[in-house]
């Protein structure tokens, strides 16, 4: 599960919903410590998304997500682009003008989904960019 | 110049610095309106970064940066990945557990830089991923 922390790098909704079905996901804004950009656990249930009536299989999948700080200095683990490195330096100088780079997927994998199309035909389709393989500062 | 707005999707420093040299950059957190993810103006001066003694040319470059909200629904302009679409839906359901996707470059361009290396040799090098061409939700 994702480590619990407060992450001010993201928008937080004031709405608190029941999270019993999200057992694989840590509460991303409950601790004061800000972690560096990294990959976090996230299991997505197609039932939770309301897609259970048209997706046959799988029931869900390990999607993961990216979150964390992209602060100076950006080390090698951050998979930072040259632009992100420059933006980090500009943010250091002008923090109210330019935001820090954000933590986003750098590599994504596909998954195969078996589903009913609009004509109730069973289709096996590969959906690209569904699973986070790695995260970085962009 | 970048439009002025408050963007809660980013960490903001309380440090206020002189921004006279950053004429191409709007203050990204001064207005209440939250804009959608898009490309913003940013001219980076190598002098401001303290690189003027080793970079011969150019003096600086139009780097641009990405900023803004990645909120439901993600439209076509958002260049969202499948993972970002899924993450947006999960965030709608569990806003305190999973952050929204973040606004990051989807395409980057290179620039050529003429500089002195550590041995004082003049090098012309193409630096990849220096200029934002387009932004999207990731």
């Amino acid at each position: 599960a994702a480590n619990k922390r407060k992450n001010q790098n993201r928008n937080k909704s004031s709405s608190h919903q029941d999270s019993s079905r999200m057992s694989s996901v840590g509460d991303y804004n409950t601790s004061e410590q800000k972690q560096a950009c990294k990959k976090h656990e996230l299991y997505v249930s197609f039932r939770d998304l309301g897609w259970q009536d048209w997706i046959i299989a799988p029931e869900g999948y390990a999607a993961f997500y990216c979150d964390g700080e992209c602060s100076f200095p950006l080390n090698a683990h951050m998979n930072a682009t040259n632009h992100a490195i420059v933006q980090t330096l500009v943010h250091l100088m002008f923090p109210d003008h330019v935001p820090k780079p954000c933590c986003a997927p750098t590599k994504l994998n596909a998954i195969s989904v078996l589903y009913f199309d609009d004509s109730s035909n069973v289709i096996l389709k590969k959906y690209r960019n569904m699973v986070v393989r790695s995260c970085g500062c962009h | 110049a970048a439009n002025k707005r408050k963007n809660q999707n980013r960490n903001k420093s309380s440090s206020h610095q002189d921004s006279s040299r950053m004429s191409s950059v709007g203050d990204y957190n001064t207005s209440e309106q939250k804009q959608a993810c898009k490309k913003h103006e940013l001219y980076v001066s190598f002098r401001d970064l303290g690189w003027q003694d080793w970079i011969i040319a150019p003096e600086g470059y139009a780097a641009f940066y990405c900023d803004g909200e990645c909120s439901f629904p993600l439209n076509a302009h958002m260049n969202a990945t499948n993972h970002a679409i899924v993450q947006t839906l999960v965030h709608l359901m569990f806003p305190d557990h999973v952050p929204k996707p973040c606004c990051a470059p989807t395409k980057l361009n290179a620039i050529s830089v003429l500089y002195f290396d550590d041995s004082s040799n003049v090098i012309l090098k193409k630096y990849r991923n220096m200029v934002v061409r387009s932004c999207g939700c990731h």
């Epitope: - | 003027q52 003694d53 011969i56 003096e59 002195f116 041995s119 040799n121 003049v122 090098i123 012309l124």
Partner: antibody, heavy 121, light 108 residues
């Protein structure tokens, strides 16, 4: 068309500071590197250093401890100061422009006509 | 620093003849960052060639430059009376920027 004109005293006493100014006309001093080169009588050329209009400098190492090049963009001028001069610093001093882009760098064009500075008591 | 050695020191030729001037670098000059200048007595040097082989604006096509690495050549295909002068090479591929000692082309 851009023109460069050196000015300053033609005679400097040993141990004193040589001061020269180069006035640029026909073009803005902005966006270029501006250089000083010298030529002792009957000898070859020696690069002294350059300044970018924004103020960054680079000097020839043997002269670095004695040289200061500065720029005044409002007057479209740049200047050379060479301290603790000796007779070996007697030379014709030239100012010149260096192009400054990734495709145009490092050669001197145009040059000022030069000014002879003699170091003697 | 890169030391540039020019040869010969003096070249005695007649108008109409071909002049070949050599400039040899103590180490490789990156990206052919080499220029040639002409200097007449009492005058400032004038840029002839940059980038080892590109003619500067207004320079007659009888002047040509060639070479790369450590060996560079300035060729004057047919000497005109106004070409008799001192010629300097200069490298700008490394700091400090350096000049060769010069080659004097004199009338034979």
């Amino acid at each position: 068309q851009v023109q460069l004109q050196e000015s300053g005293p033609g005679l400097v006493k040993p141990s004193e500071t040589l001061s020269l100014t180069c006035t640029v006309s026909g073009d803005s001093i902005s966006s270029y590197y501006w250089s000083w080169i010298r030529q002792p009588p009957g000898k070859g050329l020696e690069w002294i250093g350059y300044i970018y209009y924004s103020g960054s400098t680079r000097y020839n190492p043997p002269l670095k401890s004695r040289v200061t090049i500065s720029v005044d963009t409002s007057k479209n001028q740049f200047s050379l100061k060479l301290s603790s001069v000796t007779a070996a610093d007697t030379a014709v001093y030239y100012c010149a422009r260096i192009c400054s882009s990734t495709s145009c760098w490092g050669w001197f064009d145009p040059w000022g006509q030069g000014t002879l500075v003699t170091v003697s008591s | 620093e890169i030391v540039l050695t020019q040869s010969p020191g003096t070249l005695s030729l007649s108008p109409g003849e071909r002049a070949t001037l050599s400039c040899r670098a103590s180490q490789s000059v990156s990206s052919s960052y080499l220029a040639w200048y002409q200097q007449k007595p009492g005058q400032a040097p004038r840029l002839l060639i940059y980038g080892a082989s590109s003619r500067a604006t207004g320079i007659p096509d009888r002047f040509s430059g060639s070479g790369s690495g450590t060996d560079f050549t300035l060729t004057i295909s047919r000497l005109e009376p106004e070409d008799f002068a001192v010629y300097y090479c200069q490298q700008y591929g490394s700091s400090p920027l350096t000049f060769g000692g010069g080659t004097k082309v004199e009338i034979k």
